[in-house]
């Protein structure tokens, strides 16, 4: 927790941010909360980014004030205006870009005082993998596909029956650049799979970790996927 200390006789207020990750091309949230004030018109929210001349966003006197906003953030930012009064200064960011990564400052002024906290924002691409049986292959084969990743992730296969086994010799992973020339499609194939077993395809980069599970029995196929962001830390 970082507490901003007041200046020029004003008290300090607690401002809290949470490090987060943005998925490029999608919308992101930069989280920030503060000690609320009873009067909306007394609250000023400024979002700044290290190395950027203009403001990321400014909210004051109950509305957006965007005259000093940087060109790269125009038309892309919004606070949750109805939640500012309860201490929510989080910023919504449209169309996340790789270049949005960096250190942001959430700076708050209220009638109680001033405070700020920094936030590390990572950007990349991450998506849920889907594991399927590849019926076109000559042997029993599983195919794990995830449409969008960046930076290039690692892919590891695991199995419930053969715990600790190294499947690198019996798997093949490829990365295919998507049309926007940044993100990549991940395809990993696992050969010589056995029936009545649960296999997991784990995809990971420095931003996210995703797992696709498949359980193959003689009578049915069960699938499950989940994704976890790796860098959510409170400040």
């Amino acid at each position: 927790l970082i507490i901003g200390f007041g200046i020029s006789g004003r008290h300090s207020i607690t401002v809290t941010t949470v490090a987060s990750a943005g998925n490029i091309g999608e919308d992101g949230i930069l989280s920030c909360t503060f000690e609320p004030d009873i009067k909306l018109s007394d609250i000023v929210i400024q979002w700044l980014k290290e190395g950027v001349l203009g403001l990321v966003h400014e909210f004051k006197e109950g509305k957006d004030e965007l005259s000093e906003q940087d060109e790269m953030f125009r038309g892309r930012t919004a606070v949750f205006a109805d939640q500012v009064i309860v201490g929510n200064a989080s910023l919504r960011l449209k169309n996340v870009q790789l270049t949005d990564a960096g250190t942001y400052k959430c700076y708050i002024i209220t009638s109680k005082g001033k405070g700020n906290a920094n936030l590390e924002y990572k950007t990349g691409a991450f998506s849920m993998p889907e594991v399927n049986v590849d019926y076109n292959a000559s042997s029993e084969t599983l195919r794990c596909e995830a449409p969008r990743w960046f930076p290039q992730p690692t892919v590891v296969w695991a199995s419930q029956v053969d715990q600790g086994a190294n499947f690198s010799e019996v798997s093949n992973t490829s990365f295919e650049l998507n049309s926007e020339n940044v993100t990549m499609k991940v395809v990993s194939v696992l050969y010589n799979v056995t029936i009545n077993n649960t296999y997991s395809c784990m995809i990971e980069n420095d931003i996210a970790k995703a797992t696709g599970d498949i359980k193959v029995t003689e009578s049915e196929i069960k699938r499950r996927s989940h994704l976890q962001l790796l860098n959510s830390k409170a400040s």
Partner: antibody
């Protein structure tokens, strides 16, 4: 390449409504603001408003609030503008336009324009 | 709302001449932090859709001939065509993007 294809000319009665379309191609429709501009015959350009198809966020100039309604269909990459309670002063060419990308922002200068749709309001 | 005023409303020049047109805004279009003025210039030829020439007051859009130059800052802006060509016959509009968007009334350029 970026293309904006607008629907054909419309003839409407006073008091009626029309819905104009602008089909986008050559880019990711959901991540760029779509702008709408009015031009009366022999007159200048007037900005009406804009829609962000990704989340349906809209901005309007005061004059066109209640007159124009902007919507977008992500599945067909098409933006729409409905004009209601038509009057003779609504007779104009209406353009859709898209901004140049600048570090993810498309709230910029209008680099791409549709060919325009002529709306004629006449009894 | 920001009001944009253009002058003259029309002018006629001979091919090869230099021409300047003015655009004034009712309030400053300058971002004091980035030092950019949010003003663009558009050209609209008869029967065509508009085309952007200049953005941020003085940056030329790619593919625009270098005879077109934008200048100015704050509230006063100028578009200069150093040597007018017959194909420059058009109406020229300025547009602010400091607060939403507003176009000026236009300057009609005719070739003698």
């Amino acid at each position: 390449q970026v293309q904006l294809q607008q629907s054909g000319a419309e003839l409407a009665r006073p008091g009626a409504s029309v819905k104009l379309s602008c089909k986008a191609s050559g880019y990711t429709f959901t991540t760029y603001w779509m702008q709408w501009v009015k031009q009366r015959p022999g007159q200048g350009l007037e900005w009406i408003g804009a829609i962000y198809p990704g989340d349906g966020d809209t901005r309007y100039t005061q004059k066109f609030k209640g007159k124009a309604t902007l919507t977008a269909d992500k599945s067909s990459s098409t933006a729409y503008m409905q004009l209601s309670s038509l009057a003779s002063e609504d007779s104009a060419v209406y353009y859709c336009a898209r901004g140049r990308d600048y570090s993810g922002s498309s709230w910029t200068w209008f680099a791409y324009w549709g060919q325009g749709t002529l709306v004629t309001v006449s009894a | 709302d920001i009001v944009m005023s253009q002058s003259p409303s029309s002018l006629a020049v001979s091919a090869g001449e230099k021409v300047t047109m003015s655009c004034k805004s009712s309030q400053s279009l300058l971002n004091s932090r980035t030092r950019k003025s949010y003003l663009a210039w558009y050209q609209q030829k008869p029967g065509q859709s508009p085309k952007v020439l200049i953005y941020w007051a003085s940056s030329r859009e790619s593919g625009v001939p270098d005879r077109f130059t934008g200048s100015g800052s704050g509230t006063d802006f100028t578009l200069t065509i150093s040597s007018v060509q017959p194909e420059d016959l058009a109406v020229y509009y300025c547009k602010q993007s400091y607060n939403l968007y507003t176009f000026g009334g236009g300057t009609k350029l005719e070739i003698k």
